[in-house]
Interface confidence: low
């Protein structure tokens, strides 16, 4: 029998640094935990203790944080190159910056394959992109070979940047001619590692002939057996087995998300190529475990230049913003208005002659506004200021909902009215009248919504029956400030970008600003 | 702290092919946060990258010198080499190794040089 | 290949004075460039990384600024070990190419 060791991560979004343990800020150094220089200490201690060992990632390294913003992936790059890291597959992320913004930091300066098979280019770019990215990989291990295979998410286009010389199939459908292929080589190990989510990895298992181990990405799930170390709930077992259509066992993993946790997994395999066994966890990557001194001290290094970053100037306001809590937690608010036009514009994607766009509506807790922006500043705003503001370091995410759902959402909004709690909602996209003069839970009187398939948009009734997409923080996805009918009743979740850096990309595009109350909420007495 | 030294001959003839290693003390090539690069200046004139190598082998070649360049590893040695076939008397140049950190690819630490002479 | 093009390519300053060198790239490299100061006779030694980060161990005299296609090395009061010259390096795209130089002399 012959062991593979496999090591993986998923989903870090730029927590270069070590974060605290909820994937924010550090603020107490002892607690904190993740980041790439404590990551090194772990994967450098298994490679001198284990013979056959792999470091893979499955993708949406970009986007998260500062230092993705200013380095747009050239940290990426240099650090995963610096820990040594075998392959990797794209992630929907790793187009938020366009085609360019991927080949020339990340794929061109990559020391690793970074692989994805149902990604297809044409046009001029398919000459351009060449080689650049693969759909598999052989690699020797010891005196084996292992073939690595990728895959994205299909929902690529509509979460990300791609442009229009990328195709992107369907993952099955892609992935078995290559792993075919694979078999023609005489490779009998074969590693499907790819980010479209954790029911997609799952079919790959039980679909594709010949893929051994699924390595995920995408949904941020944790798996664990036993007692889990950390906060977060497990899925499932690690690694989850599927029983494949042909009869095999196949394990699956995805190690949650940020650099929290390294995945850590142990495959037996016969002479044969098939799989005798695996087991593992994922490893827990707390204070316990020393930051690399090498490692931080480049940390260090690169960081000089995001604290300089932050004070500059973004673009201006030459309005006040308000985003105190007695305005965005009672009515509608600018600030409000503000951080939702630029959520929706984030997430402008003209796919479908059909749609001006495929999402008009978002929707954001009041009590996640946390500072107003004062424009007597000389009306600066800085990544500093918006901060402030965003201080939770959360994403903007693309939902799924029925109808019924955001009614119910927008009744939570208003259920305890006038205690300043933080589910009042502010709105893109969305005109809502509230009555509060009728019983909790009945208090949306008008709910109007902005149509996408459409080439003039205007305001119609909201359908209860209806699927809508909606722009969201993750917060609220994950049934935040009481909103768990969002959690509970969704239909999809994609998670977006990081607040603040969809919020200074829109104020540095539009240069200044000056968004105002124009009644997308208002309230009301009386009969309608 | 890490020093790289150039060797090799001082003259070669045209249409030979010159040969140059340089030794990295004081750290390892196996550092993967950087890899190693071949430079050289003509007398008199600016600076030309010839190439780069990763500590697992990856090269890459400047195009105006691909067809006559090989640079190797040998991680056993703390070694990389340069090899330049067919050489005229334009590649007479002060030859420069150097380690370039990845990301920027800012060039960190330098050899002192060694003086490439192609003459008959 | 991008094209790296400095200016002036020589210059005369004495002790004390500002200075400030141009490297101009032929198309958008962002903020990867990198500037050298060559001695005669010696390596070059890196300054600035990044367009405008100064490298450890670099008096603070010494500053790089600039993205797209305009970068500048601007050194605040020249002092006698300054007399140089200085190359530019774009690390953008492949190969990677340096400017011509520009050679600080004492006037």
């Known amino acids: 029998a012959w062991e593979l060791t496999i090591l993986h991560t998923n989903d870090v979004h730029s927590r270069l640094e070590q974060t605290s343990e909820d994937s924010s800020k550090c603020v107490n150094a002892s607690r904190c935990m993740g980041g790439v220089a404590r990551l090194f200490t772990k994967v450098q201690q298994i490679r001198r203790a284990e013979p056959n060992v792999l470091l893979l990632d499955a993708g949406d390294q970009y986007q998260g944080t500062i230092w993705f913003t200013v380095y747009k992936g050239a940290e990426v790059a240099h650090f995963m190159n610096a820990l040594r890291y075998d392959a990797m597959a794209l992630g929907n992320h790793e187009f938020d910056n366009g085609v360019e913004g991927l080949i020339e930091p990340l794929l061109k300066e990559a020391k690793f394959p970074i692989l994805s098979a149902n990604i297809k280019a044409k046009g001029p770019l398919a000459s351009q992109i060449s080689g650049l990215y693969l759909p598999y990989k052989v690699l020797p291990v010891g005196d084996e070979v292992v073939g690595i295979v990728g895959y994205t998410s299909k929902e690529t286009p509509f979460l990300s940047n791609p442009g229009t010389n990328l195709v992107f199939e369907d993952e099955i459908t892609a992935l078995q001619p290559e792993v075919d292929k694979l078999k023609t080589l005489n490779v009998n190990k074969i590693i499907a590692l790819g980010h479209s989510g954790f029911e997609m990895d799952k079919l790959i298992a039980q679909k594709v002939r010949g893929v051994d181990v699924v390595v995920g990405g995408h949904s941020n799930t944790f798996l664990y057996t036993g007692n889990p170390p950390s906060k977060e709930v497990p899925a499932g077992k690690y690694p989850f087995i599927v029983t494949s259509d042909d009869g095999r066992k196949v394990p699956v993993v995805q190690a949650y998300a940020f650099g929290k946790y390294l995945g850590y997994l142990k495959i037996e395999f016969d002479e044969r190529g098939n799989v005798i066994s695996s087991h593992g966890n994922p490893i827990l990557l707390n204070s316990s475990i020393p930051e690399d001194p090498s490692i931080k001290a480049d940390i260090n290094k690169w960081r000089i230049k995001l604290d300089n970053y932050s004070t500059q100037e973004l673009g201006k306001t030459i309005v006040y913003l308000d985003g105190s809590s007695q305005s965005c937690r009672f009515r509608e608010c600018n600030m409000g208005n503000l951080i939702c036009d630029a959520m929706i514009n984030n997430n402008l994607r003209h796919t479908d002659e059909m749609f001006w766009n495929h999402v008009s509506m978002c929707i954001l807790n009041g009590g996640g506004i946390r500072s107003p922006i004062d424009e007597r500043n000389n009306g600066t705003i800085t990544w500093e200021n918006l901060a402030a503001v965003l201080p939770f370091g959360g994403t903007f995410d693309l939902v799924q909902l029925k109808g019924s759902t955001l009614k119910k959402a927008f009744e939570h909004s208003v259920h305890r009215y006038g205690q300043s709690t933080g589910e009042f909602l502010q709105v893109g996209g969305i005109h809502v009248v509230y009555d509060l003069s009728r019983k909790p839970g009945d208090r949306v009187v008008k709910l109007d919504v902005l149509c996408t398939k459409c080439r003039v948009p205007s305001y119609d009734p909201l359908k209860m029956d209806e699927v809508y997409k909606v722009i969201l923080p993750n917060f609220l996805a994950n049934g935040g400030d009481g909103f768990q009918m969002i959690k509970d009743e969704l239909l999809r979740h994609d998670s977006g970008d990081q607040d603040i850096n969809v919020v200074s990309t829109y104020i540095s595009k539009m240069k200044v600003i000056y968004p105002a109350v124009e009644g997308r909420i208002k309230f009301s007495t009386g009969s309608h | 702290q890490l020093q790289l030294q150039e060797s090799g001959p001082g003259l070669v003839k045209p249409s030979e092919t010159l040969s140059l290693t340089c030794t990295v003390s004081?750290?390892?090539?196996?550092?993967?946060?950087?890899?190693w690069v071949w430079i050289r200046q003509p007398p008199g004139k600016g600076l030309e990258w010839i190439g780069s190598?990763?500590?697992?082998?990856?090269?890459d070649y400047n195009p105006s010198l691909k067809s006559r360049v090989t640079i190797s590893v040998d991680t056993s040695k703390n070694q990389f080499s340069l090899k330049l076939s067919s050489v005229t008397a334009a590649d007479t140049a002060v030859y420069y190794c150097?380690?370039?950190?990845?990301?920027?690819?800012?060039?960190?630490?330098w050899g002192q040089g060694t003086m490439v002479t192609v003459s008959s | 290949d991008i094209q790296m093009t400095q200016s002036p390519s020589s210059l005369s300053a004495s002790v004390g004075d500002r200075v400030t060198i141009t490297c101009r790239a032929s198309q958008s490299i962002n903020s990867y460039l990198n500037w050298y100061q060559q001695k005669p006779g010696k390596a070059p030694k890196l300054l600035i990384y990044a367009a405008s980060s100064l490298q450890s161990g670099v008096p603070s005299r010494f500053s790089g600024s600039g993205s797209g296609t305009d970068f500048t090395l601007t050194i605040s009061s020249l002092q006698p070990e300054d007399f140089a010259t200085y190359y530019c390096?774009?690390?953008?795209?492949?190969?990677?190419?340096f400017g011509g130089g520009t050679k600080v002399e004492i006037k």
């Open positions: 190598i990763y500590y697992s082998g990856g090269t």
């Open positions: 004081g750290g390892s090539i196996l550092s993967s946060s950087y890899y």
């Open positions: 390096q774009q690390a953008y795209a492949r190969p990677r190419t």
């Open positions: 150097a380690r370039v950190m990845s990301g920027w690819l800012d060039l960190d630490v």
